[in-house]
Interface confidence: low
């Protein structure tokens, strides 16, 4: 039976490195002469770089290296034929047998990765990220798909703001240069990166990185048509309401980041809920086409929002939006009104009175405090009714006379705000005068439904 023994030895091992032990079995008494074995190497294949790379201890069967030059990248495996002879190896009287020792030379990281070119080239459109810019290729003589072969790439220069990164393709070992932060063509039109390649494990002792372990990557940035942008955005202006149509409010212009493209920007209106504005398509001048009204339902918290579009004529055309916020300062353009519009009171002045309040769509100081008054004409109004101001917003309307016949009366009330100049309004309060119980509640609703309309008398 021919035995095969397997062993390993790292490449580059020094002479005297232990490799493996082979042993033969003899049925004779190992202490008798015919059981004492001796070992020798009969042959070594291949015989490079020396025919005697290994030696065997003739008594123990220990195989050790005796020559330098083990190089996995040249010889990956040695096959030794080992002879064992009894009778202390006496070739005349001893019996012999042979076995095979297969010694595999294992890889160490004695070969650095080397770039296949001094310079690699790539290009990237501005503002794009997560795209592959360039493929870096290296060669490494160490065993593929091991830490001694797997390449690790790093950028050692030319990228101070960290716009690029390099990932390793696990199959090909290529370096994939990707963009991780957007690049602005107007700021950087080209990058020259210095890149280095190393392995996942350090190089073996005494091995240096050659110049081929570094390379340059020349990345050209491609100019892309970018969106024009308004600045500031939103633009806030303060303006009194009530401006007449045709008033120039402001100029709202956009900048185009594309300094190296000859382009024009045109302006259009996107949103103008009340249709108060127009924008000059060429110079961005915003002009009123209607009266601005702070009290419009389109104005929220005194602010009117309009949005505009700036479009360039690039290929493809790009656009950006901007919001104009007009903070409308109140003017006294609304006369106050009286609430409620209808009320109820008793035929006699006691026990109740009518509470009235002011409503003004303007805000301070163009609203309250309010003045309440009754008109001089018709004379019956002031004769029959009296109005008393409780505070800036409230007043009370009471019967002045001891009795007024049940019916429905229209009482005009003059209300004036505190604006400068003030605004006045005559509000008509429809007062239902009725017979009341002791609690001041109407008791004759049915009778009054058909009652005629009076003018306060």
């Amino acid at each position: 039976l021919h035995q095969v023994w397997n062993g390993t030895v790292p490449e580059g091992s020094k002479p005297g490195t232990y490799v493996m032990t082979v042993t033969a079995i003899d049925a004779d008494d190992p202490n008798a002469l015919n059981g004492m074995l001796r070992y020798r190497i009969v042959s070594q294949a291949p015989s490079t770089p020396s025919p005697n790379m290994f030696t065997i201890n003739n008594e123990t069967g220990d195989i050790i290296t005796v020559a330098a030059g083990l190089d996995r990248e040249k010889v990956q495996q040695y096959t030794l034929i080992i002879q064992a002879t009894d009778m202390e190896g006496n070739p005349t009287y001893g019996l012999s047998n042979t076995a095979t020792a297969v010694i595999t030379v294992t890889d160490v990281n004695d070969n650095p990765p080397e770039f296949t070119a001094m310079t690699f080239y790539g290009e990237v459109p501005e503002n794009r990220v997560d795209i592959i810019v360039a493929n870096l290729t290296v060669t490494d003589k160490d065993q593929p798909h091991t830490p001694a072969w797997n390449a690790v790439y790093r950028i050692s220069g030319g990228d101070p703001t960290g716009r690029f990164a390099i990932q390793t393709d696990p199959n090909s070992n290529d370096g994939l240069v990707t963009v991780v932060k957007p690049i602005d063509f107007e700021t950087n039109r080209m990058f020259v990166l210095t890149v280095a390649a190393e392995n996942q494990v350090p190089l073996a002792k005494g091995i240096q990185h050659p110049p081929q372990s570094t390379a340059t990557v020349s990345v050209t940035v491609i100019d892309v048509n970018e969106n024009p942008y308004f600045a500031p955005n939103p633009k806030i202006i303060r303006q009194e309401e009530g401006l007449h149509a045709g008033t120039m409010l402001t100029t709202f212009t956009a900048q185009d980041p594309d300094r190296y493209m000859q382009q024009n920007i045109r302006y259009t209106k996107l949103s103008d809920p009340a249709n108060w504005l127009k924008i000059d398509p060429v110079n961005g001048q915003i002009t009123t086409i209607a009266v601005l009204d702070r009290e419009s339902p389109n104005v929220k918290n005194n602010i009117y929002n309009a949005t505009f579009l700036a479009s360039d004529n690039g290929i493809p055309p790009m656009s950006g939006t901007g919001t104009l916020q007009i903070y409308l300062l109140d003017i006294n353009d609304n006369a106050p009104q009286v609430l409620p519009q209808e009320a109820e009171t008793c035929e006699t002045p006691d026990p109740n009175s009518i509470n009235i309040t002011a409503l003004d769509y303007d805000i301070d100081p163009n609203a309250g405090p309010f003045a309440f008054d009754l008109p001089l004409s018709p004379v019956t109004i002031k004769r029959n009714w009296t109005i008393t101001r409780l505070n800036g917003d409230f007043a009370q309307l009471n019967l002045k006379i001891k009795f007024l016949e049940a019916g429905i009366y229209e009482v005009p009330i003059i209300i004036t705000d505190s604006g400068n100049p003030p605004k006045s309004n005559i509000s008509i309060l429809r007062v239902k005068v009725c017979q009341c119980d002791s609690n001041g509640d109407c008791t004759d609703v049915d009778r009054i439904v058909g009652a005629g309309l009076g003018t306060g008398a």
């Epitope: 303060r238 918290n301 005194n302 602010i303 903070y327 301070d364 100081p365 400068n420």
Partner: antibody, heavy 119, light 107 residues
Framework: QVQLQQSGAELVKPGASVKLSCKAS????????IQWVKQRSGQGLEWIGW????????KYNEKFKDKATLTADKSSNTVYMEISRLTSEDSAVYFC????????????WGQGTTLTVSS | QIVLTQSPAIMSASLGERVTMTCTAS???????LHWYQQKPGSSPKLWIF???NLASGVPDRFSGSGSGTSYSLTINSMEAEDAATYYC????????FGAGTKLELK
């Protein structure tokens, strides 16, 4: 930046009057209402009234209309509040504040003036 | 005039606890005109929340405000030591009034 600087603490005898000031800076004085608020020790806030430098309009809380008088000096961007016929009930911290652009909130406040009425 | 009633008058909360205080108006108030202020002893009040739910500049986002009509509230979703203060609600819808305040203490 917007600031409302109030005059220093006052110790006044009962029956006398006192005039507190509130100097505005960092914004257009005539665009905003200046409010006055009273706070007695350990108590809540009580609105006294407002002054509108743009037109000279004034509005008082009914409770204070015979107690406080609001005036202003546009040249120095200062609003004044005179409190008359002082009693111990008037001892309090008085704040001036600016009414914001919308909703009526008070967006900036003075540091307050402490008024002590004591004989 | 509109009366604002704040409840509770005094409350205490542990660090990390959720806190809610309420402000009830005697008649309906537009949400645009209901505001909250924070005041610490010896300091001026500070605008804290305006128009019911908008946080003033510099106010941490653990604060929020909500409500409509006559019922409004201020909530702190996780109490911190610096939140101990008195909080006042304020309306400018009809005339101008403040609530009596809710004093929030650290437990």
């Amino acid at each position: 930046q917007v600031q409302l600087q109030q005059s220093g603490a006052e110790l006044v005898k009962p029956g006398a009057s006192v005039k507190l000031s509130c100097k505005a800076s960092g914004f257009t004085f005539t665009d905003y209402l200046i409010q006055w608020v009273k706070q007695r020790s350990g108590q809540g806030l009580e609105w006294i009234g407002w002054f509108y430098p743009g037109s000279g309009s004034i509005k008082y809380n009914e409770k204070f209309k015979d107690k406080a008088t609001l005036t202003a000096d546009k040249s120095s961007n200062t609003v004044y509040m005179e409190i008359s016929r002082l009693t111990s009930e008037d001892s309090a911290v008085y704040f001036c504040a600016r009414r914001g652009d919308w909703g009526g909130f008070f967006d900036y406040w003075g540091q307050g003036t402490t008024l002590t009425v004591s004989s | 005039q509109i009366v604002l009633t704040q409840s509770p008058a005094i409350m205490s909360a542990s660090l990390g606890e959720r806190v809610t205080m309420t402000c009830t108006a005697s008649s309906s108030v537009s949400s645009s005109y209901l505001h909250w202020y924070q005041q610490k002893p010896g300091s001026s009040p500070k605008l804290w929340i305006f128009s019911t739910s908008n946080l003033a500049s510099g106010v941490p986002d653990r604060f929020s405000g909500s409500g409509s009509g006559t019922s409004y509230s201020l909530t702190i979703n996780s109490m911190e030591a610096e939140d101990a203060a008195t909080y006042y609600c304020h309306q400018y819808h009809r005339s101008l009034t403040f609530g009596a305040g809710t004093k929030l203490e650290l437990k």
